[in-house]
């Protein structure tokens, strides 16, 4: 089958209320078939490529386990499983300041050197 | 050949800990995540958490977070699940499994035979 | 969590007859769903990876189809070997999960 390409899939938006959870989903598509090398993922908040990072998680060759390097305040987890190609995001314990815009990325090292970012990211309502 | 041989059963009061121990042979212990399942009398599967061996890396089960940790010693090949703070309900077969790996697909291809750790006072 | 709900919870068929089990998940798991059958007293073994591919030495009676939330185990012509607990498991999201579980007899 053809290679796939970069995608991300995002909502436009995430609602809840101040004091509860959100989940932010994120998934992508990549032309690396059958990768299993270095991952990293990241959200960072505000503006794609250049806003501060809210989450950062490493898994190691051939582990599905990913690591988690930064939490904001110990407050964002990963639900999804990166190497299923989903980077879906938990936020607890909601603060009105979390109402702004999310960007996923994900990056490939090792023997495939690759990353992609979302462009327009998910934009979380916190009430 | 591929084999998980774990420690043998346990008898524990509330409110102890257990250790239980899985070692691993016939494989690079370092490179594949363990993880740890557990099935009450009679019931279903329930993951607990997992850990990579090389890395030393662990992500646990919510459920599980506060009274479980799990640990490796690549010298010896054995990956171990600690639970505190043991009740009733934590009467289970407890089982580590290695999460395999094909062509960028990940599964559980080898269990260990299950340890059974009863909670009784 | 991801609640996978499988269906029937237990199941008699004739030797020889096709055994169908159902597992569906609360929300989309993409194709990220194995099976693994369980013998009484014995540890899981894997039958099924990524909804479809059948594990190293699994016999080709069974098979799995699906994705997104529902899932499908078949074993074509059921065997005597087979009488076992079947579950199945989603590895798309933290914490993997199991369904509870369908027991399959002879009927």
């Known amino acids: 089958s053809p290679a796939q390409r970069w995608s991300m899939q995002v909502p436009p938006e995430v609602s809840a209320e101040a004091g509860d959870a959100a989940v932010l989903p994120c998934t992508f598509t990549h032309p690396h078939r059958h990768y299993d090398g270095p991952l990293t993922a990241i959200w960072r908040a505000g503006e794609p490529y250049a806003g501060p990072q809210v989450f950062r998680c490493a898994a190691a060759r051939g582990s599905e386990l990913c690591q988690t390097a930064l939490s904001l305040h110990g407050r964002f987890r990963l639900l999804g499983n990166p190497r299923r190609n989903d980077l879906s995001l938990r936020v607890e314990r909601l603060a009105l300041a979390d109402d702004r815009r999310y960007f996923c990325r994900v990056e490939f090292a090792g023997d495939v050197h690759d990353r992609y970012e979302s462009r327009h990211g998910v934009r979380l309502h916190v009430t | 050949q591929v084999q998980l041989v774990q420690s043998g059963a346990e008898v524990k009061k509330p409110g102890a800990s257990v250790k239980v121990s899985c070692k691993a042979s016939?494989?690079?212990?370092?490179?594949?995540?363990v993880s740890w399942v557990r099935q009450a009398p009679g019931q279903g599967l329930e993951w607990i958490g997992v850990?990579?061996?090389?890395?030393?890396?662990?992500g646990y089960n919510e459920k599980f977070k506060a009274r479980v940790t799990i640990t490796a010693d690549t010298s010896t090949s054995t990956a171990y699940m600690e639970l505190s703070s043991l009740r009733s309900e934590d009467t289970a077969v407890y089982y580590c499994a290695r999460r395999g790996l094909n062509k960028g697909y990940w599964f559980f291809d080898f269990w260990g035979q299950g340890t059974l750790v009863t909670v009784s006072s | 969590d991801i609640v996978m709900t499988q269906s029937p919870d237990s199941l008699a068929v004739s030797l020889g007859e096709r055994a169908t089990i159902n597992c569906k998940a609360s929300?989309?798991?993409?194709?990220?769903v194995d099976w693994y059958q369980q013998k009484p007293g014995q540890s899981p073994k894997l039958l099924i990876y990524?909804?479809?591919n059948r594990y190293t030495g699994v016999p080709d009676r069974f098979s799995g189809s699906g994705s997104g939330t529902d899932f499908t185990l078949t074993i074509s012509s059921l065997q005597a070997e087979d009488v076992a607990v079947y579950y199945c498991?989603?590895?798309?999201?933290?914490?993997?999960?199991f369904g509870q579980g369908t027991k399959v007899e002879i009927k």
């Open positions: 016939g494989y690079t212990f370092p490179r594949y995540d």
């Open positions: 498991m989603q590895s798309n999201f933290f914490p993997f999960t």
């Open positions: 990524e909804s479809t």
């Open positions: 929300q989309n798991v993409g194709s990220n």
């Open positions: 850990i990579h061996p090389g890395s030393g890396g662990t």
